[in-house]
């Protein structure tokens, strides 16, 4: 039986040009996390697996940055970056949970959750 | 396996910098971060900051910002921590520690750094 | 920045016994991670996710825990578990540590 619950960052807004932290936690389950996908709509953003570590998509390669934790920062952010955001977390036995998050990228100053992280 | 091998130790004069190494092997040194803790007697364990290799994305704890500069060449699988300016507070132990899904699985020997004129 | 409060900060057991500590975490975190250091070691990953243990850990090690409370227990003391233990927090930058919590052997 699935007893786990995913807890989300909900919805967030931030700058056009600044960064965010994408974020789910999985909590009242002692399954075993054995990976962990971000993906935009039907796009794939990055995998996080127990033996292989993390692989980030080409395409976004430049601009996402593992952590904090299982989480993903997004920089650069383009209001095309504006949309739904989901976390899959495999587990082991529960299956698959999934998380989700809005986020709507904004042209004014309402930037929340900012970064640390610098791609150089 | 999985290895993180430091050089032991460093001595180094007040004022003066210090780059020290992590060489990485028995995995994809591109697909896990790499994290720099300082470990001293009275502070315990201190997250300096991160660094992904895979696109050289770092973030800092704002305490080390201006004091750590965190540094991978892929080429040597080597990660590399540079402290500047350096005083006696910064004289201590300093862990290099990937991480993947599981926080951060493997740690080096840690290179002891000794600030002394 | 979130602050990880272990006690106790040391403590002794004799070979057999239960051994509990805990840590307490100053706002809400999802897991909580632990780590064993031994005189002249690096540190060594112990337990991920709050309850699962790390590779090579022995059963008699198990965590516990959930939102700002969490703890380590030792199910029988060995003298090999003499060492340092620390908790650390991995869901929010600056990643934090505890204090540690020193356990010796009686």
């Known amino acids: 039986m699935m007893t786990g619950t995913i807890e989300t960052t909900g919805n967030i807004s931030a700058e056009k040009g600044g960064s965010i932290i994408l974020q789910c936690h999985l909590s009242s389950t002692t399954a075993q996390v054995t990976q962990v996908n971000w993906e935009q709509q039907d796009q794939l953003l990055a995998i996080c697996n127990a033996d292989l570590g993390w692989h980030i998509s080409p395409s976004f390669k430049d601009r996402v940055a593992p952590g904090p934790g299982l989480g993903l920062t997004l920089q650069s952010l383009t209001v095309n970056d504006t949309g739904e955001y989901f976390c899959i977390y495999h587990t082991y036995p529960d299956g698959t949970y999934t998380g989700r998050i809005f986020l709507e990228v904004l042209e004014s100053s309402v930037a929340e959750h900012g970064a640390r992280f610098q791609i150089p | 396996q999985v290895q993180l091998q430091q050089p032991g130790a460093e001595l180094v004069k007040p004022g003066a910098s210090v780059k020290m190494s992590c060489k990485a092997s028995?995995?994809?040194?591109?697909?896990?971060?790499m994290h720099w803790v300082k470990q001293t007697p009275g502070q315990g364990l201190e997250w300096i900051g991160g660094?992904?290799?895979?696109?050289?994305?770092?973030s800092y704890n704002q305490k080390f910002k201006g004091k750590a500069t965190l540094t991978a060449d892929k080429s040597s699988s080597t990660a590399y921590m540079q402290l500047s300016s350096l005083t006696s507070e910064d004289s201590a132990v300093y862990y290099c520690?990937?991480?993947?899904?599981?926080?951060?699985?493997?740690w080096g020997q840690g290179t002891s750094v000794t600030v002394s004129s | 920045q979130i602050v990880l409060t272990q006690s106790p900060a040391i403590m002794s057991a004799s070979p057999g016994e239960k051994v509990t500590m805990t840590c307490s975490a100053s706002?809400?975190?999802?897991?909580m991670y632990w780590y064993q250091q031994k005189t002249g070691s690096s540190p060594r990953l112990l337990i991920y996710?709050?309850?699962n243990l790390a590779s090579g850990v022995p059963v008699r090690f198990s965590g516990s825990g959930s939102g700002t409370s969490y703890s380590l227990t030792i199910s029988r003391m060995e003298a090999e578990d003499a060492a340092t233990y620390y908790c650390?927090?991995?869901?929010?930058?600056?990643?934090?540590f505890g204090g540690g919590t020193k356990l010796e052997i009686k």
């Open positions: 520690a990937r991480s993947g899904l599981r926080a951060m699985d493997y």
């Open positions: 028995g995995y994809t040194f591109t697909s896990y971060n």
């Open positions: 660094i992904y290799p895979g696109n050289g994305a770092t």
């Open positions: 706002s809400s975190v999802s897991y």
């Open positions: 996710d709050t309850s």
């Open positions: 650390q927090q991995w869901s929010s930058y600056p990643y934090t």
